[in-house]
Interface confidence: medium
C-alpha cells in the first residue's frame, strides 16, 4: 500500500508521542556520542516537518523516503567529522548506501561513561520538574549505549520506568519502592538488548534464511497447535519486523509489530490458547506479553515423525519440489514435539537432516541411505544434555561466584588473547546460566540454558569483531551460528599462547577494595584471576583454587584491620610471594 508521504503515514499510524520517541531512539542509536540536547533539537525539527506532511502530503519533500529524511537530518550535525571521524564519509553517499554506512558504524561498545544512578530524591525532583525531558533522557541514554535495542520494546521499558517514578516518588519510603524496580528494569533491559543483538547478528551475518529457521523452531515450540501455514505467516511477518528494526527502520518496525500483535490476537483461536490475557492488555504490554508467552500444550495425538520424513517413499520427491518448505515442515514438526530442546539443537537436527537428504537423494537407493537419519540425532541431543547436567552439578556445588570463576579459568585458557575485562564480563554472564536455568526441571533446562548461552556468546562475538585478536574466536563466531556454543565448548587450552610475563603489580591491592560493592569486589578478584591464568595457563584447578582462597582470606583480613593500607602492603607482598611459589612462577 503505497502512501504519498511515508513520514505522514507513520506519524498518523504511531501518534505523535511514539513517533517522537522512536525518532529519538533511531538518532541516538546512529549518533551515539551526540549530546542529548542536539538530538532533541533534531527530533523536534523532524516532528514539525512530519506535521506539515500530515496537513498536506503533497508538500515539498514529503514524498522522500524516511532514510533520506533522517539521513539528511543526521548529516546536518556540525561536529560529525571531529566526533565520529570516518563516519562523516557516509554523508557523501546516496541512499541506500548512506544508511548502510551508518549501520556499519554502530558501536556495540561505545566510549561512554557508565550510567551512575543519582540519589532517589534527586531523581524524583527531576521527574516532577520535567517529566517529558526525564523520560526522553532515559530513551536517549539506553539507545546510545545499546544501538540495536529493540525500539518498540524500549518504549515498553520507558512506560514501566515512568510508572515506577509515578508510584514511588509519592511513597513514604521512596528508595525502598523505587530501587528494586530500577534494578529489575536494568537487568531486564540488559537481557533484552543482548537477545535482540543476537537476532540482528543472525540477520546481518547469516541472512534471512537463518533467522527464519530460528523463528520457525521457536514459534513452533510456542504454538504447537497452530498449523504450519499459520506458523509460516507469523515467521514471515516477524522476520519483516526484525529486519526493519535491525536495519534502523524503527517507525516501520514499530508499526508492523503493532499490526502483528493485532493479527495474533484476532486469530488466537488458531494460534494458541495462552494468548487470552496478553490480548486484553494495551498495545506495548500486549506485544511484550506475546513475545514472552509460555508454550501452549502440545496436541495429544501427534503421529510419529518418521512416517513423513523417513519411512515415506516420497521424501526425496517432496524435498526436491520445494526444499525450504519441506525442511521448514520438518523443523516445525520436530519443534512442536520438543519444547524440551533448545532452538539451536533443533536447528542442528534440521541441518543434519538437510545434509543427509542432499547426499541420499542423489544416491542409488535414497531410502536405504536416509533410513537411519534419526540415529544421527542421538549424539547431537546427548551432547547439550550431558553438558548441562555436568555444569548444573558444578553450579550447585560451587554457587554462582565460584562457578563464574571456573568458567573464567576455562575460557581464559581457551582464548587468552581476549582482553581481560571482556573475558570477565562474558564469563560472569555465562556463569549466570546456573541461577537462571539450573533451578528448572529437566524438560526446561536445555531451552533455557543453551539458548541463553547463544545470547552471551554472541556478545563475545560482536565485541571481538570490533578488534579481532583471536583466530579461534573468529572461527567459532563465523563458521556456524547454531554451532557457536559447541565450537567454544570443544576448544582446549591454546597451546600456541605465549604466557604473559609475571607482574606482581597485577596482584597488588589497596584499602579501596574494602569500600566497593560486593559485585565490584568480585569483578576485581575475577580480573586478577584472569591475569593469573594468562601468566600461568597450565596452572591446575587446585593451584588456582588455593591461590584464590588465600586471596579472599587476605582481602577479608585486611578489610578488618585497623591500618588497612599497611595490611594490604605487607600481607600483599607475602601473598604474591606465596602465590608465585604455589604456581611455580
Amino acid at each position: 500500500d503505497a502512501h504519498k508521504s511515508e513520514v505522514a503515514h507513520r506519524f498518523k499510524d504511531l501518534g505523535e508521542e511514539n513517533f517522537k520517541a522512536l525518532v529519538l531512539i533511531a538518532f541516538a542509536q546512529y549518533l551515539q556520542q551526540c549530546p542529548f540536547e542536539d538530538h532533541v533539537k533534531l527530533v523536534n525539527e523532524v516532528t514539525e516537518f512530519a506535521k506539515t506532511c500530515v496537513a498536506d502530503e503533497s508538500a515539498e519533500n514529503c514524498d522522500k523516503s524516511l532514510h533520506t529524511l533522517f539521513g539528511d537530518k543526521l548529516c546536518t550535525v556540525a561536529t560529525l567529522r571531529e566526533t565520529y571521524g570516518e563516519m562523516a564519509d557516509c554523508c557523501a553517499k546516496q541512499e541506500p548506501e548512506r544508511n548502510e554506512c551508518f549501520l556499519q558504524h554502530k558501536d556495540d561498545n561505545p566510549n561512554l561513561p557508565r550510567l551512575v544512578r543519582p540519589e532517589v530524591d534527586v531523581m524524583c525532583t527531576a521527574f516532577h520538574d520535567n517529566e517529558e525531558t526525564f523520560l526522553k533522557k532515559y530513551l536517549y541514554e539506553i539507545a546510545r549505549r545499546h544501538p540495536y535495542f529493540y525500539a518498540p520494546e524500549l518504549l515498553f521499558f520507558a512506560k514501566r520506568y515512568k510508572a515506577a517514578f509515578t508510584e514511588c516518588c509519592q511513597a513514604a519510603d521512596k528508595a525502598a519502592c523505587l530501587l528494586p524496580k530500577l534494578d529489575e528494569l536494568r537487568d531486564e533491559g540488559k537481557a533484552s538488548s543482548a537477545k535482540q543483538r543476537l537476532k540482528c547478528a543472525s540477520l546481518q551475518k547469516f541472512g534471512e534464511r537463518a533467522f527464519k529457521a530460528w523463528a520457525v523452531a521457536r514459534l513452533s515450540q510456542r504454538f504447537p497447535k497452530a498449523e504450519f501455514a499459520e506458523v509460516s505467516k507469523l515467521v514471515t511477518d516477524l522476520t519483516k519486523v526484525h529486519t526493519e528494526c535491525c536495519h534502523g527502520d524503527l517507525l516501520e518496525c514499530a508499526d508492523d509489530r503493532a499490526d502483528l500483535a493485532k493479527y495474533i490476537c484476532e486469530n488466537q483461536d488458531s494460534i494458541s490458547s495462552k494468548l487470552k490475557e496478553c490480548c486484553e492488555k494495551p498495545l506495548l504490554e500486549k506485544s511484550h506479553c506475546i513475545a514472552e508467552v509460555e508454550n501452549d500444550e502440545m496436541p495429544a495425538d501427534l503421529p510419529s515423525l518418521a512416517a513423513d520424513f523417513v519411512e515415506s517413499k516420497d521424501v526425496c520427491k517432496n524435498y526436491a519440489e520445494a526444499k525450504d518448505v519441506f525442511l521448514g515442515m520438518f523443523l516445525y514438526e520436530y519443534a512442536r514435539r520438543h519444547p524440551d530442546y533448545s532452538v539451536v539443537l533443533l536447528l542442528r537436527l534440521a541441518k543434519t537432516y538437510e545434509t543427509t537428504l542432499e547426499k541420499c537423494c542423489a544416491a542409488a537407493d535414497p531410502h536405504e541411505c536416509y533410513a537411519k537419519v534419526f540415529d544421527e540425532f542421538k549424539p547431537l541431543v546427548e551432547e547439550p544434555q550431558n553438558l548441562i547436567k555436568q555444569n548444573c552439578e558444578l553450579f550447585e556445588q560451587l554457587g554462582e561466584y565460584k562457578f563464574q570463576n571456573a568458567l573464567l579459568v576455562r575460557y581464559t585458557k581457551k582464548v587468552p588473547q581476549v582482553s581481560t575485562p571482556t573475558l570477565v564480563e562474558v564469563s560472569r554472564n555465562l556463569g549466570k546460566v546456573g541461577s537462571k536455568c539450573c533451578k528448572h526441571p529437566e524438560a526446561k533446562r536445555m531451552p533455557c540454558a543453551e539458548d541463553y548461552l547463544s545470547v552471551v556468546l554472541n556478545q563475545l562475538c560482536v565485541l571481538h569483531e570490533k578488534t579481532p585478536v583471536s583466530d579461534r574466536v573468529t572461527k567459532c563466531c563465523t563458521e556456524s551460528l547454531v554451532n557457536r556454543r559447541p565450537c567454544f565448548s570443544a576448544l582446549e587450552v591454546d597451546e600456541t599462547y605465549v604466557p604473559k610475563e609475571f607482574n606482581a603489580e597485577t596482584f597488588t591491592f589497596h584499602a579501596d577494595i574494602c569500600t566497593l560493592s560486593e559485585k565490584e569486589r568480585q569483578i576485581k578478584k575475577q580480573t586478577a584471576l584472569v591475569e593469573l591464568v594468562k601468566h600461568k595457563p597450565k596452572a591446575t584447578k587446585e593451584q588456582l583454587k588455593a591461590v584464590m582462597d588465600d586471596f579472599a582470606a587476605f582481602v577479608e583480613k585486611c578489610c578488618k584491620a585497623d591500618d588497612k593500607e599497611t595490611c594490604f602492603a605487607e600481607e600483599g607482598k607475602k601473598l604474591v610471594a606465596a602465590s608465585q611459589a604455589a604456581l611455580g612462577l
Epitope: P421, E505, H510, I523, T527
Partner: nanobody, 123 residues
Framework: EVQLLESGGGLVQPGGSLRLSCAAS????????IGWFRQAPGKEREGVSC????????NYADSVKGRFTISRDNSKNTVYLQMNSLKPEDTAVYYC????????????????WGQGTQVTVSS
C-alpha cells in the same frame, strides 16, 4: 581491546604548561591502570607517572615530582597529565599505556600503547 590516543602535545617555552590527554576507545578504562611514558631521541623509554584503575594510588618519576599531576575521568574514559614548570629536558614523545588494575614498575608490563604525542620545550 583498548585503543589509546594521546593529544595535547606541542611547543611550549620553558616554565610553561601543557595538559596531555589519553582517551580510550574499544573498552571502558574502569579496570585499567594508565601510565605515562616518554622517550627522548636516542634514549630509552622511561616512566613518568601512573594512576591505578581506582584512581586511589598514583606515582611519579623523581624528575617530575611536584611539577606533573596525573588524574583520570572514568566518565570520559580519559586520563590527563598536567605538566607545569616545563624544562627543556622534558622534551620527548609522550606515550600513554594501559595495564589491568594496577600500575607497573616495568615498561613491558603494559598491555596497550598509544601512538604518542610530541612535547617540545624550547625558547
Amino acid at each position: 581491546e583498548v585503543q589509546l590516543l594521546e593529544s595535547g602535545g606541542g611547543l611550549v617555552q620553558p616554565g610553561g604548561s601543557l595538559r596531555l590527554s589519553c582517551a580510550a576507545s574499544g573498552e571502558t578504562l574502569d579496570y585499567y591502570a594508565i601510565g605515562w611514558f616518554r622517550q627522548a631521541p636516542g634514549k630509552e623509554r622511561e616512566g613518568v607517572s601512573c594512576i591505578a584503575s581506582s584512581g586511589g594510588s598514583t606515582n611519579y618519576a623523581d624528575s617530575v615530582k611536584g611539577r606533573f599531576t596525573i588524574s583520570r575521568d572514568n566518565s570520559k574514559n580519559t586520563v590527563y597529565l598536567q605538566m607545569n614548570s616545563l624544562k627543556p629536558e622534558d622534551t620527548a614523545v609522550y606515550y600513554c599505556a594501559a595495564a589491568v588494575l594496577e600500575c607497573r614498575t616495568v615498561v613491558r608490563g603494559y598491555d596497550y600503547w598509544g601512538q604518542g604525542t610530541q612535547v617540545t620545550v624550547s625558547s
